[in-house]
């Protein structure tokens, strides 16, 4: 993408500013909060989208919970620490020098501390499962023909390998998509599946950070694939730690 | 079925200008990247210019960046490359194809039949 | 740019033979590559996408492997009808580059 072009823009996401001062007098695009660079042919990372997010902070995100392993994301927004590379730091803070621990797509999954508090490593969220409800249609969609249409999206819109579309469930009007992605899977250059699954859930609210004025058009053989509730469940490679206080 | 039909290619003198355009059919076109490609006589498939589905993002490759515009309508399921200062080295046979679903960069599973496009005086 | 290297330019080899095309890109794609067949006089057909994933309706004799900066299309049992051109194409992000074709004909 070059500035040669009247559009000096981050197809990928639209919480940057660009300018055409990189290699060459490429287009080079830096996240909103942060000022990171970040790659435009592909999906910035959560953190970096979160911290942008924070400059023009939205409603707060609640998530449900299927089992006592499933995280909830249901403190709200909070402005993260990002490493290097874009990912959440392992622990948390906020200004109030309250600390917790997060997994890779930032959820909490410890109670929370003060500044003592020791998060030894980021705990890889390896499996998520969103589950949609879909607004009512003639008919129910033909499974086959809603598979293939959610594992394109995912591949060619999100850019996600299509090994890491696990599977896709459906019983109208309910929709279950299962991302995995073990830390072994996943290879340098893949999109990681909490980032595709934080733009599909943006996508779905009409929140698109593609740069397009589109938005997200899902069809099914023509028909409109309209998401009027979705939940999104996250697992990690190592349960959360959570006192028995919480969960009572 | 699904299908891509280009129209407007042509001898045209170097210089001047020429638009071939693409229509659609069979699929939903404006779900999806659209692609412009072209092969020069006995030579290899070259990449010219894509447009996202929405019309948001178009790249072009270097060779034809300032001379090439590609559009879109999707109402009339309709892609366009306008082709302005056109050089002997743009003789070619051009394709549009379809890329990415909701998106510009994917691999091309369709494509259309050709309209040949000769520069020459 | 990404530079997309296709080796070797053509090849000849008998039927029910193992043929193997490889692709270099001179810097890293992920899985973002395709690759094409272009018979004769004829439109290039998607076979694989994302360096491993067969296209519907393409025979499984036709395999793609690699990561990153090195892909291989393999024909297990090499047909008369695969008598064509071969394109690697890394779709990563614009340019949109095709390697230079192997050329593929019967001993």
């Known amino acids: 993408h070059t500035a040669a072009q009247d559009n000096c823009t981050c197809p990928t996401n639209k919480m940057t500013v660009c300018s055409p001062d990189g290699p060459g007098g490429r287009c080079q695009c830096r996240a909103l909060g942060s000022g990171v660079a970040v790659d435009c042919s592909t999906l910035t990372s959560e953190c970096l989208l979160l911290k942008a997010r924070m400059s023009a902070p939205k409603n707060a995100r609640t998530l449900v919970r299927p089992n006592e392993h499933a995280l909830v994301d249901n403190d709200g927004l909070y402005d993260p620490d990002c490493d290097p590379e874009g990912r959440f730091k392992a622990r948390q803070c906020n200004q109030t020098s309250v600390c917790w621990c997060v997994n890779s797509v930032g959820v909490r999954r410890t109670d929370k501390g003060d500044l003592s508090l020791r998060c030894d490593e980021l705990v890889r969220t390896h499996h998520i499962l969103i589950d949609l409800r879909h607004r009512p249609t003639a008919g129910a969609f033909n499974h086959s023909d809603l598979d293939a249409e959610l594992r394109r999206l995912f591949r060619e819109r999100y850019r996600l390998h299509p090994k890491f579309v696990a599977a896709v469930h459906y019983e109208q009007p309910t929709i279950q998509i299962e991302l995995r992605q073990n830390t072994s899977q996943k290879a340098a250059g893949d999109v990681d599946i909490g980032d595709a699954a934080y733009y599909f859930e943006r996508d779905v609210k009409g929140e698109s950070l593609f740069q397009g004025r589109g938005g997200l058009d899902l069809r099914v053989r023509g028909e409109p694939l309209q998401v009027e509730r979705t939940l999104i469940y996250y697992l990690d490679e190592i349960p959360p730690k959570f006192s028995m206080k919480r969960l009572t | 079925q699904v299908q891509l039909v280009e129209s407007g290619g042509g001898v045209v003198q170097p210089g001047r200008s020429l638009r071939v355009s693409c229509i659609a059919s069979?699929?939903?076109?404006?779900?999806?990247?659209m692609h412009w490609v072209r092969q020069a006589p006995g030579k290899g498939l070259e990449w010219v210019a894509v447009?996202?589905?929405?019309?948001?993002?178009?790249d072009y490759v270097d060779s034809v960046k300032g001379r090439f515009t590609i559009s879109r309508d999707n109402s009339k399921n309709t892609l366009y490359l306008q082709m302005n200062s056109l050089r002997g080295e743009d003789t070619a046979m051009y394709y549009c194809?379809?890329?990415?679903?909701?998106?510009?960069?994917?691999?091309?599973?369709?494509w259309g039949q050709g309209t040949m496009v000769t520069v020459s005086s | 740019d990404i530079q997309m290297t296709q080796s070797p330019s053509s090849l000849s080899a008998s039927v029910g033979d193992r043929v193997t095309i490889t692709c270099r890109a001179s810097?890293?794609?992920?899985?973002?590559l395709a690759w094409y067949q272009q018979k004769p006089g004829k439109v290039p057909k998607l076979l694989i996408y994302?360096?491993?994933t067969l296209q519907s309706g393409v025979p499984s004799r036709f395999s793609g492997s690699g990561s990153g900066t090195d892909f291989t299309l393999t024909i297990s049992s090499l047909q008369p009808e695969d008598v064509a051109t071969y394109y690697c194409?890394?779709?990563?992000?614009?340019?949109?580059?095709f390697g230079g074709g192997t050329k593929v004909e019967i001993k």
């Open positions: 810097q890293g794609i992920s899985h973002f």
């Open positions: 447009i996202w589905y929405d019309g948001s993002n178009e």
């Open positions: 194809a379809r890329g990415g679903y909701n998106s510009g960069w994917w691999a091309f599973d369709i």
């Open positions: 194409q890394k779709f990563n992000s614009a340019p949109l580059t």
């Open positions: 069979g699929f939903f076109f404006s779900s999806y990247g």
């Open positions: 994302a360096a491993s």
